[in-house]
């Protein structure tokens, strides 16, 4: 999902995959969230470091994990890409710096009255990428005023430099407020010479024209179709610029097509993601993973919720299918293309939706109006945690839900088995989103031990909280990991952002949701929750979270499933879903087991033979 | 010069079956994607049925799956579009086109139509 | 599938106006949608392709705009032989869908 936190004081250990000068964090975000591997960017302030060579320094990064260990550094903020940000995504950067010099090409001087006239003059002019403006209080009097026009063969700068009375900026071309205007046409079987900045393989020649659009120093491009007489060359979207700013020849070609960069579009730029499935192509790269997944549109979907998923193919061959599924190969190369297209295929193959500033409606594919009480639809792997707990007699049920803890423990709420000890009859369903795919193909755990704490008692609500061992230890994905532990008798952390998650009832008499639902629902103290429920006791051990005119809250089959809260960027598990007054009603909020208050039992109850605790805690 | 020419059309029974031809020339054949499209009387033009440049790749409207068959002769430089099962609905005038590429830049040369009506 | 919508579904225009059809898709098409003219008893003929470009041999009054969900057709300045029937079309899916078309008369 999208991770939007920035640490303070904290650099990212490893992953390197590019460095560059910028002049803040925020503008190293946004290059690492249009590198087509960042995940993860450090950003080195000049406060930060004396070393000259690394002031400004922005170090993009890669995880296999989707996270790198973070080490104290006085000054430095690190933080997490904005792919998957949606309306967050954007390479239009309008800040100013002052007292910075911004070092490239400086390729135009003019005399400006001001930083803004600067900026303009940078936007609207077609090779510009960043500028500096001397002020009128600049030490040397001939400099004053002078607007330089820059450009760097990465689009950022090449050294930033710390002077007083410069002003430096970026040109807003990629806010689409460019005068220049842009052509929209593009050519077939017409080639344009010039200067070739990069290469990459596309499907198509409008694939081509965005990848030239978001590219720093592309200004046309050249795009040789899948039937070009040499065959090695096929496919290729040659990336191009030239001294003026215009091909300087043009020459016909079959079975070429030609255009220009959209960047200085006034209105609106395309959006930086490519959408369309193109069927009968295979798109080669080193692969991720392979999913079974019921139709190319799930697979694009599987993709985008895959941060580090940048395209794929979805394989209809007879071997590779299963009744209505068929593998989905989840691939990525060093550029972000494909590097290899074949057609003629048995597959389908298109991009992930990461960077689709639109957000998720784009990939959605499931509308549903029934939701837990006032929630909303998940998204693949945004809770990898959630297991959906189901009881197979005649017929199978979801019955309850329950947290992934460890590669063979979940834990879940004592009352889920009242009635049901029987570990034989129930199924547990991981890495799941909807409840539809779950077919008798779909893989499930089975349960070793049912462990229910040795207080509880049946219908009484004080120490509702079981653990659950695997017969087999799950392996960690995308869709299904651990969620933390709090510390042992976690009292001190000020909770402000925490959901609760459940395929259970969307109003009091509902019924099963199909879709994992979630509900952001703020914590109450245990006073004013006791006030509520002046027939019970809300003890220590219980947390409560609602709100006062109620209207979001979990309901029947949520049970046992978790209440999570995001502190300094890690989730962890608050509560387990346990009782209420109703479902959402007003005053009534819900009581959740406290799961710090119930460390010690955990890890008792989870330790190995070896001794070593088999669940997630925090570092 | 490019040219698509359509033939096969006719009056059918209900039930009955039809095959359209399509020849091409004036361009190279195998290198398109080629599609059918019809115009039902008093309505638009709905497209049909697609191949790919090899032959490999076919693509159907719902109202036809099951019932028509496209395919294709690089050496004969001819399209076909084999039509069974055929319903008064099927009643319009049928045109082949040529795709360039993928047909992500429309269907660029069209022939002149031939008019399949199906009644009792 | 994606749908595409015609508006209006006829005008009624003199030689020498300004006319624009708009062409709504129900999803984002980027710039995958092209623009054809049909005349009774001919061809259809592409206009358009990629929302902007103009298809060879396709006189320059007619031009094309939009990207995402909404485009247009715009003849600059009407000539006799442009009163016929308009249809978008977009590239971006399979199957690949028509506008309901807008005919375009003689006022």
């Known amino acids: 999902g999208c991770l939007t936190q920035l640490y303070e004081n904290a650099f990212f250990r490893g992953g390197d995959v590019a460095s560059m000068y910028t002049p803040n964090a925020q503008y190293c975000q946004m290059r690492c969230t249009f590198h087509p591997r960042c995940l993860l960017f450090s950003f080195l302030p000049a406060s930060s470091i004396n070393d000259m060579e690394k002031r400004f320094g922005c170090f993009l990064k890669d995880s296999v994990t989707g996270t790198l260990p973070k080490v104290h550094r006085t000054g430095a903020v690190s933080g997490h890409s904005l792919k998957q940000c949606g309306h967050q995504i954007s390479a239009c950067h309008r800040d100013i710096y002052k007292g910075v010099d911004m070092r490239g090409v400086n390729f135009n001087v003019s005399k400006v009255s001001s930083v803004e006239e600067c900026q303009k003059r940078c936007t609207s002019n077609i090779r510009c990428q960043f500028f500096s403006y001397a002020t009128q209080t600049f030490h040397k009097a001939e400099y004053r005023n002078n607007c330089l026009l820059k450009y760097s063969p990465g689009g950022t700068p090449t050294a930033i430099k710390v002077l007083s009375n410069v002003e430096s900026g970026f040109s807003l071309k990629p806010c689409a407020l460019s005068e220049i205007g842009c052509h929209m046409n593009i050519f077939q079987h017409l080639a344009f010479s010039d200067v070739d900045v990069a290469r990459v393989l596309t499907p198509d020649a409008f694939v081509c024209r965005t990848i030239c659009t978001y590219h720093p120093n592309c200004l046309f491009f050249t795009f040789y179709t899948n039937v070009w007489k040499i065959e090695s060359q096929r496919n290729v979207c040659l990336l191009k610029t030239s001294e003026s700013g215009t091909p300087s020849s043009s020459t016909p070609q079959e079975n070429t097509i030609s255009g220009y960069s959209l960047l200085t579009c006034k209105r609106t730029l395309p959006e930086p993601c490519h959408s369309k499935i193109y069927p009968g192509v295979d798109f080669g790269g080193e692969e991720l993973n392979v999913t079974f997944v019921k139709g190319v549109n799930v697979c694009q979907e599987t993709c985008t919720k895959m941060i580090r998923c940048q395209f794929f193919t979805y394989s209809l061959l007879p071997e590779d299918c299963k009744e209505e599924k068929c593998k989905c190969f989840l691939r990525l190369s060093m550029d972000g293309s494909p590097t290899r297209i074949a057609y003629g295929t048995q597959g389908s193959s298109g991009y992930s939706l990461r960077l689709c500033n639109t957000g998720d409606n784009s990939v959605c594919t499931t509308k549903t109006s029934t939701r837990i009480v006032g929630g909303t639809n998940s998204s693949w792997g945004e809770w990898p945690w959630q297991v959906s707990l189901q009881v197979k007699l005649t017929a199978q049920r979801h019955l309850c839900g329950g947290s992934l803890i460890g590669h063979q423990w979940v834990l879940t709420a004592a009352h889920c088995f009242d009635g049901l000890p029987l570990q034989d009859v129930w199924r547990i369903y991981s890495g799941i989103l909807n409840l539809s795919d779950i077919t008798k193909d779909t893989p499930f755990s089975q349960i070793k031990e049912i462990i229910i704490h040795q207080n509880y008692k049946v219908s009484e609500g004080n120490h509702d909280i079981a653990l659950i061992k695997l017969q087999a230890p799950l392996n960690y994905t995308e869709f299904q990991k651990p969620i933390c532990l709090p510390s042992k008798g976690d009292t001190s952390t000020i909770y402000t952002n925490c959901w609760v998650t459940g395929w259970g009832f969307s109003k009091e008499k509902g019924e099963i949701q199909n879709i994992l639902q979630k509900v952001n629902i703020p914590l109450v103290t245990n006073e004013e929750c006791q006030k509520r429920y002046q027939d019970y006791k809300i003890t220590q051990r219980m947390v409560c979270a609602g709100y006062k005119e109620g209207g979001k809250d979990a309901c029947k089959g949520d049970s046992g499933g978790p209440l999570v809260c995001k502190h300094n960027g890690m989730w962890r598990l608050v509560g387990i879903t346990s009782w209420g007054e109703g479902c959402a009603r007003r005053e009534q909020p819900g009581v959740y087991t406290k799961v710090a208050e119930y460390m010690d039992w955990i890890l008792e109850k989870t330790q190995s033979s070896d001794g070593k605790a088999q669940m997630q805690s925090p570092a | 010069e490019v040219q698509l020419l359509e033939s096969g059309g006719g009056l059918v029974q209900p039930g009955g079956s039809l095959r359209l031809s399509c020849a091409a020339s004036?361009?190279?054949?195998?290198?398109?994607?080629m599609l059918w499209v019809r115009q039902a009387p008093g309505k638009g033009l709905e497209w049909v049925s697609g191949i790919g440049p090899s032959g490999g790749l076919t693509a159907y409207a719902d109202s036809v799956k099951g019932r028509f068959t496209i395919s294709r002769d690089n050496s004969k430089n001819t399209l076909y579009l084999q039509m069974n099962s055929l319903r008064a609905e099927d009643t319009a005038v049928y045109y082949c086109?040529?795709?360039?590429?993928?047909?992500?830049?429309?269907?660029?040369?069209w022939g002149q139509g031939t008019t399949v009506t199906v009644s009792s | 599938d994606i749908q595409m919508t015609q508006s209006p579904s006829s005008l009624s225009a003199s030689v020498g106006d300004r006319v624009s059809i708009t062409c709504r898709a129900s999803?984002?098409?980027?710039?995958?949608l092209n623009w054809y003219q049909h005349k009774p008893g001919k061809a259809p003929t592409l206009l358009i392709y990629g929302a902007f470009s103009l298809q060879s041999g396709v006189p320059s009054r007619f031009s094309g705009s939009g990207s995402g969900t909404d485009f247009a057709l715009t003849i600059s300045s009407l000539q006799p032989e442009d009163f016929a029937t308009y249809y978008c079309?977009?590239?971006?899916?399979?199957?690949?869908?028509f506008g309901q078309g807008t005919r375009v008369e003689i006022k």
């Open positions: 999803q984002s098409i980027s710039t995958y």
């Open positions: 079309q977009q590239s971006h899916s399979t199957p690949p869908t």
């Open positions: 086109a040529r795709a360039p590429w993928f047909g992500e830049l429309g269907m660029d040369v």
């Open positions: 004036g361009f190279t054949f195998s290198q398109y994607k």
